[in-house]
Interface confidence: low
């Protein structure tokens, strides 16, 4: 888990490498200055947005190399005894709301799968990402509005849930994931979600300022 010092360091995205480089550059230029993190993040984000694909390429290569490193290290990593694959999730807890992109995916994934039955999960996710990126800001609004409403509802629900107090995980005895017929389906769904989240993360990096301006 988080406490295991032997666990491989998580893989870094191209944007994370870019931010790291920005930080290092800033430190060199201003070794004694304290960093206003939100201001710094905003500047990084603005710079990232105006960078060409060629300029981003360097950081994408770094991310690919780091992903390979992470996968290599994870192959030989043995988690400490008693650590389970899935962390306990209270089934009664409110579900995290979907993002605008996730709602878009829910609508368009069946269409893509229908049109291209042979596409892999990864290719479907890639295509959804391309389609989302190619959808005008105004057309994203219905999804963004719906996502905002669901987020609002989730925040209310989670506040109420927390006020009640979380149930004790140990009493529930549901730490281990069920090894049922459903497991394979769940894993496939998770792969789908992970693909979408990766696309979403890229989207967030690219899109985080659009809301302010539109």
């Amino acid at each position: 888990g988080k406490g295991d010092p032997k666990k491989p360091r998580g893989k870094m995205s191209s944007y994370a490498f870019f931010v790291q480089t920005c930080r290092e550059e800033h430190k060199k230029k201003h070794p004694d200055a304290s960093v206003n993190f939100s201001e710094f993040s905003k500047k990084c984000s603005e710079r990232w947005k105006t960078m060409s694909a060629k300029e981003k390429g360097k950081f994408e290569d770094m991310a690919k190399a780091d992903k390979a490193r992470y996968e290599r290290e994870m192959k030989t990593y043995i988690p400490p005894k008693g650590e389970t694959k899935k962390k306990f999730k209270d089934p009664n807890a409110p579900k995290r709301p979907p993002s605008a992109f996730f709602l878009f995916c829910s609508e368009y994934r069946p269409k893509i799968k229908g049109e291209h039955p042979g596409l892999s999960i990864g290719d479907v996710a890639k295509k959804l990402g391309e389609m989302w990126n190619n959808t005008a800001a105004d057309d994203k609004q219905p999804y963004e509005k719906k996502a905002a409403k669901l987020k609002e509802k989730y925040e209310k629900d989670i506040a109420a849930y927390r006020a009640k107090g979380k149930p004790d995980a140990a009493k529930k005895g549901v730490v281990k994931a069920e090894k049922s017929k459903k497991k394979k389906e769940e894993e496939e769904d998770e792969e789908d979600e992970e693909d979408e989240e990766e696309e979403e993360d890229e989207e967030d990096e690219e899109e985080e300022e659009d809301d302010d301006d539109e």
């Epitope: 105006t50 959808t135 800001a137 105004d138 301006d213 539109e214």
Partner: antibody, heavy 120, light 107 residues
Amino acid sequence: EVQLLESGGGLVQPGGSLRLSCAASGFTFSWYSMLWVRQAPGKGLEWVSYISPSGGFTNYADSVKGRFTISRDNSKNTLYLQMNSLRAEDTAVYYCARWDYNSGWYYDHWGQGTLVTVSS
Amino acid sequence: DIQMTQSPDTLSLSPGERATLSCRASQSVNSRNLAWYQQKPGQAPRLLIYGASTRATGIPDRFSGSVSGTEFTLTISSLQPDDFATYYCQQYNSYFTFGQGTKLEIK
């Protein structure tokens, strides 16, 4: 190589109809938003209409709303513009363009245009 | 709708001179959502700059773009004979609007 080829332009009387086509090649058509942009003789560029990759979303400039319909056939890699109730002020060269987000959300792939003349 | 106003309408300069073309948005436009195009008579427009300041592939470095508030500027540092054309700015913030164009002509 990305290629866009417009066709269907010509001379039409006011109130008449015309259907423009834009044949796309050299890229995965179904992944990209497409647009129609026009240019009246000696005038500037005017965005006419937009369609999302799946065809699920469309939008139009106020000047053509209710008269023009954009559509696409992803199986044929073709974009269309159905123009009804044509007016003299619709006379222009009509360009189809690919909205290429990879180049920064702008369209740098254009056809050479097809001329539409509305005159009696 | 967002209006894009370009100035001047016509700019008369000689080869080797510096050209400064301006484009003002009627409301706030994310700098990422502004492009500049060049168009020559009888040809389709050609993308020069996107994201207000990033040169498109194959565009020489004499072309540069900058932004200050709602004002966007295209600068051509040293005019070449091939640069005399009409230039358009275009926003994508809420759909797509072009400026009316600036004609750059030889003095």
